[in-house]
Interface confidence: medium
């Protein structure tokens, strides 16, 4: 070829047009070109349709071409690798229809400030996504839902302040996650799921070490050998395993995995960290066993309601919904009680999957679940285990997505300790046994009567309690279209000694209703 260098590599015909001061695709390239290098040219704009005659094209390098616009038209049915790195792209084109076979997409070192909803839709074969060195502040919900085969994800060196809770849902093949050098201050509970992640880069973020960080701390402790730091010197580029590279920004660079968590809410006297553990299912690695926690799993679907779009987040732990040292009959000191941010639930209730029965039915003894003890050094309290449901998937975002839940800034007046008001003259129905049951101690599960007489808007993150009524009544008041309470769909199984008398296993005390 008069302009480009042509060579054969195995069954591939490689055409090298690098550094030729090209402003457009050179004419008359071999029709059976499979690898095309157009790096370091002055293309400014480029249309993928110009490559349609090259039906065997599997790899296209357009890096360092001063690209400000990539026109996405036509189809390149077998293109597997697209390198758009080191350009000037301000938005990511929707590539799914044009590049259905794409396995590697590199858009590192561009000027992306956000990604559109459905940015990766149609890229079901994608295995590697490189977005390092852009200006991303947030990620859209469900970004990676269309890419279940993803193995490597780089979001390093952006301006990310938070991550969507379900970002990694369904990514069973993910082995490399690069999040270093962002503005991340916390990791959402349950973010990593339960599958092994051999390579994680998390250093260079301003991690805020408070009670919200305890899930992340526990994950770091359990995955210390998989946390790496990327070191780049004059002559050496290397990665080394170093969990201490993940450091508290507010505590003199103290390693997050050693953060003591003093003063964080606890469940009785049984240790302050198990309250924050979240592993969705029992996970055995070698001889290390992780115990299943008290986890409620909700189908992750967006529900349109009269009050707007609800997102029922994929997982929530009952453990984290139980405030510490809260006696079931403690008197309210204020007419309105506000739960402080650290107890703010991170999910909305999926009404179709919960039950409230007006007339208590007699139930058989629940089948005890086997108790698995937490690995030392932190013993787990004896907890109720709900029957796990299949792992949910992140929803495809709708045209009107719900805002990502954020933890509110504390107000100038500190929120009072949560208290439960005295029962009114119309108490909640007692359990099915004829004799009155004793009030359980806080070591088991407390009876928490929380009224929700007015539904809180999705933007609000504080749960406000007013005059107490039974949970059932408040549910009926707040959901007008429910003439009858929904029927119980799940069976609660537990291994508490007093499971029959445990109010948390009673239908009318099934779940705290945070909205």
């Amino acid at each position: 070829h008069p302009i480009c260098e042509v060579s054969k590599v195995a069954s591939h015909l490689e055409v090298n047009c690098d550094k030729r001061n090209l402003t457009a695709l050179p004419p008359d390239l071999p029709k059976d070109t499979t690898i095309l290098h157009l790096s370091e040219n002055l293309l400014y704009t480029f249309s993928l349709a110009t490559l349609m005659p090259y039906t065997r094209l599997t790899q296209l390098n357009l890096d360092r071409c001063e690209l400000t616009k990539l026109q996405v038209d036509g189809t390149l049915p077998v293109l597997g690798t697209l390198d758009l790195s080191h350009n000037q792209l301000q938005s990511l084109p929707l590539l799914g229809q044009t590049l259905p076979a794409l396995t590697v997409l590199d858009v590192s070192f561009n000027r992306l400030t956000s990604l559109p909803l459905g940015a990766l839709r149609g890229l079901g074969e994608l295995q590697e996504l490189y977005l390092k060195g852009n200006e991303l502040k947030t990620l859209p919900p469900g970004l990676l839902t269309p890419t279940p085969k993803l193995e490597k994800l780089s979001l390093a060196n952006n301006n990310l302040t938070e991550l969507p809770a379900g970002l990694l849902n369904g990514l069973e093949n993910l082995d490399t996650l690069l999040l270093q050098e962002n503005s991340l201050y916390t990791i959402p509970k349950g973010f990593f799921g339960s599958h092994l992640l051999p390579f994680a880069f998390l250093h260079g973020n301003p991690w805020l070490c408070n009670c919200e960080i305890l899930y992340f701390r526990r994950w770091l402790q359990d995955n210390a050998e998989n946390v790496y730091v990327w070191k780049q010197g004059v002559d050496v580029k290397a990665m080394t395993s170093n969990v201490a590279s993940v450091q508290c920004d507010n505590s003199d660079k103290f390693p997050v995995y050693k953060y003591p968590g003093k003063g964080c809410p606890t469940l009785g006297d049984e240790g302050d960290t198990d309250l924050y553990d979240y592993y969705p299912e029992e996970d055995t690695e070698g001889d290390k066993v992780r115990a299943t926690r008290t986890v409620v799993k909700f189908p992750t679907k967006a529900h349109t309601t009269p009050w707007g779009l609800f997102y029922s987040w994929s997982t929530a732990s009952l453990d984290s919904q139980m405030p510490s040292s809260l006696h079931p009959t403690q008197e309210s000191t204020k007419e309105q009680t506000t739960f402080p941010p650290r107890w703010t639930p991170n999910f909305t209730l999926h009404m179709e999957s919960i039950t409230f029965s007006k007339t208590p039915k007699s139930t058989t003894e629940p089948t005890p679940s086997p108790t698995t003890s937490e690995p030392v050094p932190e013993p787990a309290p004896n907890m109720t285990t709900l029957e796990p449901t299949p792992s949910p998937t992140t929803p495809e975002p709708t045209s009107e997505p719900a805002p990502s839940p954020t933890t509110p800034e504390p107000t100038s007046e500190p929120a009072p300790s949560p208290t439960t008001p005295e029962p009114t003259s119309e108490p909640a129905p007692s359990p099915t046994t004829p004799e009155p049951t004793p009030i359980p101690t806080i070591a088991t599960s407390p009876t928490i009567l929380v009224s929700a007489t007015s539904l809180i808007t999705p933007k609000s993150t504080f749960l406000t309690t007013t005059k107490p009524v039974s949970l059932l009544e408040s549910t009926k008041k707040t959901i007008p279209e429910l003439d009858q309470p929904p029927k119980l769909r799940g069976v609660l199984q537990g291994h508490l000694e007093s499971s029959r008398n445990d109010p948390f296993l009673h239908p009318d005390f099934c779940c705290l209703l945070p909205l």
């Epitope: 590697v104 490189y130 790496y228 580029k237």
Partner: nanobody, 125 residues
Framework: EVQLVESGGGLVQAGGSLRLSCAAA????????MGWYRQAPGKQRELVAI??????????DSVKGRFTISRDNAKNTKNTVYLQMNSLKPEDTAVYYC????????????????WGQGTQVTVSS
């Protein structure tokens, strides 16, 4: 700089076998193609065998049926390539070089190509 570490060379009698291996550091997470080239004294460097990320392979005519190239598929050792050399002949004597192409790393780096230092294979008659 992508470093490739080769091993397995040595002295062997004609008709014998050797297995060469070449590993790139784990920090280079994605390598499009890995292969082996050789250079005999006073001759040009020539392709012996190459394997692409999709498993496609190619061999020099002179080694077809005797040499086999393979690539480790385990997650943490994906960047390792092997050359099994059977029925070795004196004319296979050369310095064997590992080559990697289309390399992406955890630092966001991209390298078009990298070479190992070479390992000596000597076949005596």
């Amino acid at each position: 700089e992508v470093q490739l570490v080769e091993s397995g060379g040595g002295l062997v009698q004609a008709g014998g076998s050797l297995r060469l291996s070449c590993a790139a550091a784990a920090s280079w997470f994605s390598i499009y193609a890995m292969g082996w080239y050789r250079q005999a004294p006073g001759k040009q460097r020539e392709l012996v065998a190459i394997i692409l990320s999709d498993g496609d392979t190619d061999y020099a005519d002179s080694v077809k049926g005797r040499f086999t190239i393979s690539r480790d598929n385990a997650k943490n050792t994906k960047n390792t390539v092997y050359l099994q050399m059977n029925s070795l002949k004196p004319e296979d004597t050369a310095v064997y070089y590992c080559n990697a192409r289309g390399i992406r790393g955890s630092g966001g780096d991209y390298a078009r190509e990298a070479w190992g230092q070479g390992t000596q294979v000597t076949v005596s008659s």
